[in-house]
């Protein structure tokens, strides 16, 4: 039959950051190609990445339709050069992915400090709100739009002249902190979703930004 020499995919893995979501699998194909299907628990299967020789498939367009849904994907293996024939009744070998709920499982991307502004002994630090491919009413949503107050940022800040750090939190994208006048400070932020109880509740730390460099403003 036409599928006897094909090998089922294995190690199906979801790779997702800020809702950009790719399904990866093995093995690298030898004389075979793959087609991916995705569905919600209650929905119909939708085919993507038809007869691809890749071992990944970008499923972002599907999962952003409802990031709170739970998705399942499966990868079918076909002989290389396979052409869909209406007469074929034999189901090709396939493997199911783990379930994936984007809202709960997408990794938080590394945040970026957009700006900081000093007025006297106060500094306002603003975290850049990342855009996602999630849409509502034909408008792309930011990370804050999607997560609301479920998303918090932790700010680490310290005097440029010392290593002793302080920290503050916000469930917006802005911090207003007290600083010593005449001192330069450095800042780094980390995104956290406190309600998550899984191993992806924190982002990596942002790059460090320091006063006296281009992102900042100082006003007396």
């Amino acid at each position: 039959s036409g599928t006897t020499n094909t090998v089922a995919a294995y190690n199906l893995t979801w790779k997702s950051t800020n809702f950009k979501t790719i399904l990866e699998w093995e093995p690298k194909p030898i004389n075979q190609v793959y087609t991916v299907q995705i569905s919600t628990k209650s929905g119909d299967w939708k085919s993507k990445c038809f007869y691809t020789a890749d071992t990944e498939c970008d499923l972002t367009d599907e999962i952003v339709k409802d990031v709170k849904q739970t998705y399942l994907a499966r990868v079918f293996s076909y002989p290389a050069g396979h052409v869909e024939s209406t007469g074929s009744t034999e189901e090709p070998p396939y493997e199911n992915s783990p379930e994936f709920t984007p809202y709960l499982e997408t990794n938080l991307g590394q945040p970026t400090i957009q700006s900081f502004e000093q007025v006297g002994t106060k500094v306002n630090v603003t975290v850049q709100d990342e855009w996602t491919l999630v849409r509502r009413n034909d408008t792309f949503l930011s990370l804050r739009d999607v997560f609301g107050k479920d998303l918090i940022y932790t700010l680490y800040y310290w005097k440029s002249s010392s290593s002793g750090k302080k920290t503050a939190k916000t469930n917006t994208n802005e911090f207003l902190i007290d600083v010593d006048k005449g001192e330069n400070y450095c800042f780094s932020v980390q995104a956290v979703i406190p309600s998550r109880r899984t191993a992806n509740r924190k982002s990596t730390d942002s790059p460090v930004e320091c006063m006296g460099h281009e992102k900042g403003e100082s006003r007396e």
Epitope: I152, T154, Y156, K165, K166, T167, A168, K169, T170, N171, I177, Q190, V192, P194, R197, T198, A199, N200, R201, K202, T204, D205
Partner: antibody, heavy 117, light 107 residues
Framework: QIQLVQSGGEVKKPGASVRVSCKAS????????VYWVRQSPGKGLEWIGY????????IYDQNFKGKATLTVDKSTSTAYMELSSLRSEDTAVYFC??????????WGQGTTVTVSS | DIQMTQSPASLSASVGDRVTITCLAS??????LAWYLQKPGKSPQLLIY???NLADGVPSRFSGSGSGTDFSFTISSLQPEDFATYYC?????????FGQGTKLEIK
């Protein structure tokens, strides 16, 4: 289930150091900060500082800088607090706790450190 | 540093009473406030987080309210096991200070 198990009580002489351990289990250790809190006899709770096992960042209360040093061993999911130059006023119960960003949801059983000549 | 002023320092009440404890922050902390209970010789136990949210497994007779600088914690009907010391804590900015505690005693 989630547990934080601390090392046993210690009696130390003034000027000595002590290391208190806090072994975490039942959760992903690097995803939660570990806080340390002191409670002197008959007194309230004092925040010492915390360590983020994910990136090693430590934050201390000014009163404990130079007194407490926080470290972690990710391979054993254990947090440590070393207290140096002990004085009688360091006699207290020391707690570790898991930080869920909005609060401290699980606490160790406490370690009594007694400083006496 | 943010100071947390908790009152009263002690409180006598009877089983079935409604009691309220307040916590005042020296500057705004939005809703970054937690409440804990501690019994003698035991570790503190989380009751309320984010000012108003009940922690897992905590009975509904406990509640929290407030935001900004003024917060309160209420037990709607005291049970015998509720006699303990209660602490508020701000988790907005370091150092993450606690209130001085309120000792709730049987009248």
């Amino acid at each position: 289930q989630i547990q934080l198990v601390q090392s046993g009580g210690e009696v130390k002489k003034p000027g000595a150091s002590v290391r208190v351990s806090c072994k975490a289990s039942g959760y992903s250790f690097t995803d939660y900060n570990v806080y340390w809190v002191r409670q002197s006899p008959g007194k309230g709770l004092e925040w010492i500082g915390y360590i983020d096992p994910y990136n090693g960042i430590t934050i201390y209360d000014q009163n404990f800088k130079g007194k407490a040093t926080l470290t972690v061993d990710k391979s054993t999911s254990t947090a440590y607090m070393e207290l140096s130059s002990l004085r009688s006023e360091d006699t207290a119960v020391y707690f570790c706790a898991r930080d869920v960003t909005t609060a401290l949801d699980f606490w160790g059983q406490g370690t009594t450190v007694t400083v006496s000549s | 540093d943010i100071q947390m002023t908790q009152s009263p320092a002690s409180l006598s009440a009877s089983v079935g009473d409604r009691v309220t404890i307040t916590c005042l922050a020296s500057q705004t902390i939005d809703t970054w406030l937690a409440w804990y209970l501690q019994k003698p010789g035991k570790s503190p136990q989380l009751l309320i987080y984010a000012a108003t949210n009940l922690a897992d497994g905590v009975p509904s007779r406990f509640s929290g309210s407030g935001s900004g600088t003024d917060f309160s914690f209420t037990i709607s009907s005291l049970q015998p096991e509720d006699f303990a010391t209660y602490y508020c804590q701000q988790v907005y900015s370091s150092p993450f200070t606690f209130g001085q505690g309120t000792k709730l005693e049987i009248k």
